[in-house]
């Protein structure tokens, strides 16, 4: 199709080489009438349609994204050619940063409902650059946490070092929906609830008087509880003795509950005590078996191919640790009688 009639938007993604970050493009088609994608030709000059990413109805999620190759080749369907770019309804998600994401992206409705819709498309010229100036040492992260029940704020990463007086007008989106009231480089949340979690996008316009472009950043916000004040507790094994059959294989499971910590470095390991000797056992990797907002249960097994007489004289110790402290639980094997 002919893209010369598409409305054009210029965007800049300045990514930090130090962190993983994502990026999104919204299919900002004009939305003068809810029932149709757009009928721009029918609008009088005074009827300026509002540009919003569309969300909600099945109709509106039915868009097609293309990339325009720089060498003049035909448009490429995003889904076929770019595995690191995912389409979700009207939004295009870039999972990894990199200058190779620079280019022109075109979106248009899949279903053309009327002759007016032919030119209904948006061309987004995306420029991707690594962050060069280290003038801002403490710029906000693209992953931000809000503490449940308390006051918090979400900062626009590209503007977090900007003083309030010099920061520009910002447009915020949450999960693709425009937050029309928010205009500052920081969203202040009076009381944090779990619904504040989500993907936030902050846009501001930068200009050189000849042209202007949108600078965009994406922030993943999660709601968290306060860091635990407790060391982990071992849920299993509960007993300090375990009846076993000699010559048979045995798996002993250690399950421990770790309270939430923002910087989470759980330790769960098995070691063996034999008279005065003590050594750590190489056992299968630990795995998380249950994760909630407040805590996580992690399991690690020790596997004996067959229980020997020597194993009955040993103590098998599960050791768990977080930043607060550690807990141990030892198990003595006992031969099953009868």
């Amino acid at each position: 199709f002919n893209i010369s009639g598409c409305s054009t938007k210029k965007l800049l993604w300045t990514y930090s080489t130090r962190s993983e970050e994502e990026f999104v493009l919204f299919c900002d088609l004009p939305e003068p009438q809810k029932s149709h994608f757009c009928h721009r030709n029918r609008l009088s000059p005074k009827q300026v349609p509002e540009h919003l990413p569309f969300m909600g109805s099945n109709d509106l999620s039915d868009v097609q994204w293309y990339q325009q190759p720089s060498n003049g080749d035909p448009l490429e369907d995003i889904r076929k050619s770019y595995p690191h770019i995912i389409q979700d309804k009207c939004t295009l998600h870039f999972l990894t940063p990199g200058v190779n994401n620079s280019g022109s992206y075109i979106c248009r409705p899949k279903m053309i409902k009327s002759p007016y819709d032919v030119a209904c498309c948006v061309k987004m010229i995306l420029e991707v650059k690594p962050q060069t100036n280290a003038s801002c040492e403490y710029s906000a992260s693209h992953k931000q946490d809000l503490l449940l029940g308390s006051t918090g704020s979400i900062s626009c990463p590209s503007l977090s070092c900007q003083s309030d007086a010099q920061s520009p007008a910002v447009t915020w989106y949450k999960n693709g929906k425009l937050l029309s009231v928010e205009r500052s480089n920081r969203i202040v949340v009076d009381e944090v609830y779990d619904y504040h979690q989500g993907t936030y996008v902050c846009d501001y316009t930068q200009s050189d008087t000849v042209s202007s472009w949108t600078v965009r950043a994406v922030v993943q916000v999660r709601t968290i509880v306060g860091d635990t004040k407790l060391k982990p507790d071992i849920l299993d094994p509960v007993e300090d003795t375990l009846e076993v059959e000699l010559g048979k294989p045995l798996t002993i499971s250690c399950k421990a509950r770790f309270g939430f910590e923002r910087v989470f470095n759980p330790v769960i390991k098995w070691y063996i005590k034999d008279s005065d000797l003590e050594w750590e056992v190489s056992v299968p990797e630990a795995k998380s078996i249950k994760s909630t907002l407040k805590d996580e249960i992690i399991e690690r097994n020790i596997i004996l191919e067959k229980v020997t007489q020597r194993d009955l004289r040993r103590k098998f110790v599960c050791f768990v640790q977080n930043s607060i402290g550690n807990t141990t639980q030892s198990v003595q094997l006992k031969e099953k009688r009868g």
Epitope: L159, D164, A165, Q166, S167, P168, A169, V170, T205, Q206
Partner: antibody, heavy 118, light 112 residues
Framework: SVEESGGRLVTPGTPLTLTCTAS????????MCWVRQAPGKGLEWIGF?????NTYYATWAKGRFTISRSSATVDLKITSATAEDTATYFC????????????????WGPGTLVTVSS | AQVLTQTPSPVSAAVGGTVTINCQAS????????LAWYQQKPGQPPKLLIY???KLASGVPLRFSGSGSGTQFTLTISGVQCDDAATYYC????????????FGGGTEVVVK
Amino acid sequence: SVEESGGRLVTPGTPLTLTCTASGFSLSSYHMCWVRQAPGKGLEWIGFIKADGNTYYATWAKGRFTISRSSATVDLKITSATAEDTATYFCARMFYAGHTSGHYFDLWGPGTLVTVSS
Amino acid sequence: AQVLTQTPSPVSAAVGGTVTINCQASQSVYNNKNLAWYQQKPGQPPKLLIYDASKLASGVPLRFSGSGSGTQFTLTISGVQCDDAATYYCAGGYDSSVDTFAFGGGTEVVVK
């Protein structure tokens, strides 16, 4: 374009509100500032209002002026006019040139004249 | 309060000549370059000429140029034309919640 209105002849002590309207761009997406110019004198920055409603003033203007905004207008209220407030009042749009540079006034209205006299 | 001092005033120049206007700030502008030059003709609002100390605004003739950083700035008009007769103002932006912006006193350019 930007246009100011509300300028007129008032007596000292009278409050007066000047209004700034825009066409061709969304006023709510920009910071807007007010500047005045007494007859035959230079430009004097009064203050500005950000898109989020936060206001900033020159030291001399604090308490004498209040800037506010709605979705369609930006207002400047002269709390109690004095003879030295006689001036042409300009409303200007602020554009952002980036965080290593800052804001500038790129689009000005023709101005509205306020005369304070008894 | 921030003070911007412009010199000289007035300044007169012949058509085709060069005019240099200086602007000295009492303290460094934001990021050392948040300085603009505006041109104002009688009965008209100011017009942005230069921003970021040296960048030319859209539609401004190349005979206008700006330079400087921190507290000292200069506007130069090379090859002055009759149409350049106007008053020129420098304006600085600051990283401050009061007096965020300030204008210089203005320099009148008379073209002979």
